[in-house]
């Protein structure tokens, strides 16, 4: 129950990629506004996105303080123009979000192949170490900085002229693979956190092929 002209938010959903984290919900407001609160399991509630008509709230600044914590958010509904009004229980209507642990649940963003360099019959493929919004000592940490060895990359590669795909993995952001001289190869990479139970893999990177500008060839 609540005031006659407000409805509780529903379908509260965390949308998070590389720790950029937004809480979304429904419905689109009609004569009402929302305020979001976020808390760790043991912490105090902090209000964000005050009296907004949006149905999303960027909570990145809060969750990056400790990405290994588990967070809970709640969305309060208020009548537009009368935000002091409360429900029959003496407080505004609200709905809780599912719990969210960024380190375990944030989606891995699509990686990018930074470069590849051929030297003879070997190709060194380097994956860009994407910057996140997680900070330490006033600097932004990269994905590798945050996840360490929990993060691996899988390389898919194949001859330009065939469909047979090979794979390799690495615990760094580099691969060094054997290729046939005189053949052009194409590459795609995927970020993986093997220890996870959900959101283990990113989407594949865009395909990069030898003979294009990202590559370099040396005898």
């Amino acid at each position: 129950s609540g005031t006659t002209n407000t409805v509780a938010a529903y379908n509260l959903t965390w949308k998070s990629t590389n720790f950029k984290t937004i809480l979304e919900w429904e419905p689109k407001p009609v004569n009402q506004v929302y305020t979001v609160q976020i808390s760790t399991k043991s912490g105090d509630w902090k209000s964000k996105c005050f009296y907004t008509t949006d149905t999303e709230c960027d909570l990145t600044d809060e969750i990056v303080k400790d990405v290994k914590q588990t967070y809970l958010a709640r969305v309060f509904s208020y009548p537009a123009g009368n935000v002091e009004s409360t429900g029959s229980a003496g407080e505004p209507l609200y709905e809780n979000s599912p719990e969210f642990t960024p380190y375990l649940e944030t989606n891995l963003g699509q990686p990018t192949i930074q470069s590849f360099e051929q030297v003879g019959t070997k190709v060194n493929v380097t994956v860009e170490d994407e910057r996140t919004l997680v900070r330490r000592n006033n600097t932004f940490l990269s994905l590798r900085d945050v996840f360490g060895k929990d993060l691996i990359y899988t390389l898919y590669y194949w001859k330009d002229s065939s469909t047979g795909r090979k794979t390799n993995t690495t615990h760094t952001n580099e691969f060094l693979i054997d290729v046939d001289k005189g053949e052009n190869y194409c590459f795609s990479v995927q970020a993986v956190i093997p220890s996870r139970t959900v959101n283990r893999k990113s989407t594949d990177s865009p395909v990069e092929c030898m003979g294009q500008e990202k590559g370099e060839f040396r005898e």
């Epitope: 590798r144 060895k149 390799n168 615990h171 760094t172 580099e174 691969f175």
Partner: antibody
Framework: QVQLQESGPGLVKPSQTLSLTCTVS?????????WSWIRQHPGKGLEWIGE???????RYNPSLKSRVTISVDTSKNQFSLKLSSVTAADTAVYYC??????????????????WGKGTTVTVSS | EIVLTQSPGTLSLSPGERATLSCRAS???????LAWYQQKPGQAPRLLIY???TRQTGIPDRFSGSGSGTDFTLTISRLEPEDFAVYYC?????????FGGGTKVEIK
């Protein structure tokens, strides 16, 4: 070449916190390796305690996780181990080690290739 | 956790003989993550083999590693006096990283 040196008290009282520091010389702690702590009980095998990256990213042995904190100080080129609520069962030689990437089969994997000499810690009242 | 069982516990051999040390895992281990270490009394362990079969720089070619899945082997083709020590296998693919209980190679 890189060398590691453990330091800290050799005697700790039961229920107190064991604190050790590993100083890295001959290389930067921020150069893409991981830094580990391993212990060896008297006359026994090796037990991995945990590791840290220069960014502060850590992994711990679940059997010790509730009592262990590993931290890094890049300005001093050091990393540290704290083990709380110690008992006689924590008496051991404690080693720090570098976990460095080695090329294998198309990718790079980490192995503990440089170790400190080890420091003996006895837990006793 | 992955349990590594080494056998035999002690191997008594003479210099010049061949030593075969076994390491069996409780579940499959990707060979990329399998290493062998040597430890002498009063010293820290030393990395010998990584990736199950690749010798670390400076390790003599009398040391060789093999195996995959759950069964791995360290072979010392001709024992030198300095090879008498304790040998540990280790997996670094799954947390917690674990070591075998060790095989002591002693002079017969």
């Amino acid at each position: 070449q890189v060398q590691l040196q453990e330091s800290g008290p050799g005697l700790v009282k039961p229920s107190q916190t064991l604190s050790l520091t590993c100083t890295v010389s001959g290389g930067s702690i921020s150069s893409g390796q991981y830094w580990s702590w391993i212990r060896q009980h008297p006359g026994k095998g090796l037990e991995w305690i945990g590791e840290i990256y220069y960014s502060g990213s850590t992994r711990y042995n679940p059997s010790l996780k509730s009592r262990v904190t590993i931290s890094v100080d890049t300005s001093k080129n050091q990393f540290s181990l704290k083990l709380s609520s110690v008992t006689a069962a924590d008496t051991a030689v404690y080693y720090c080690a570098r976990d460095a990437p080695y090329y294998y089969g198309g990718g790079y994997y980490y192995y503990m290739d440089v170790w400190g000499k080890g420091t003996t810690v006895t837990v006793s009242s | 956790e992955i349990v590594l069982t080494q056998s035999p516990g002690t191997l008594s051999l003479s210099p010049g003989e061949r030593a075969t040390l076994s390491c069996r895992a409780s579940e499959s281990v990707d060979s990329s993550y399998l290493a062998w270490y040597q430890q002498k009394p009063g010293q820290a362990p030393r990395l010998l083999i990584y990736g199950a079969s690749t010798r670390q720089t400076g390790i003599p070619d009398r040391f060789s590693g093999s195996g995959s899945g759950t069964d791995f082997t360290l072979t010392i083709s001709r024992l030198e006096p300095e090879d008498f020590a304790v040998y540990y296998c280790q997996q670094a693919g799954v947390v917690p990283y674990t070591f075998g209980g060790g095989t002591k190679v002693e002079i017969k």
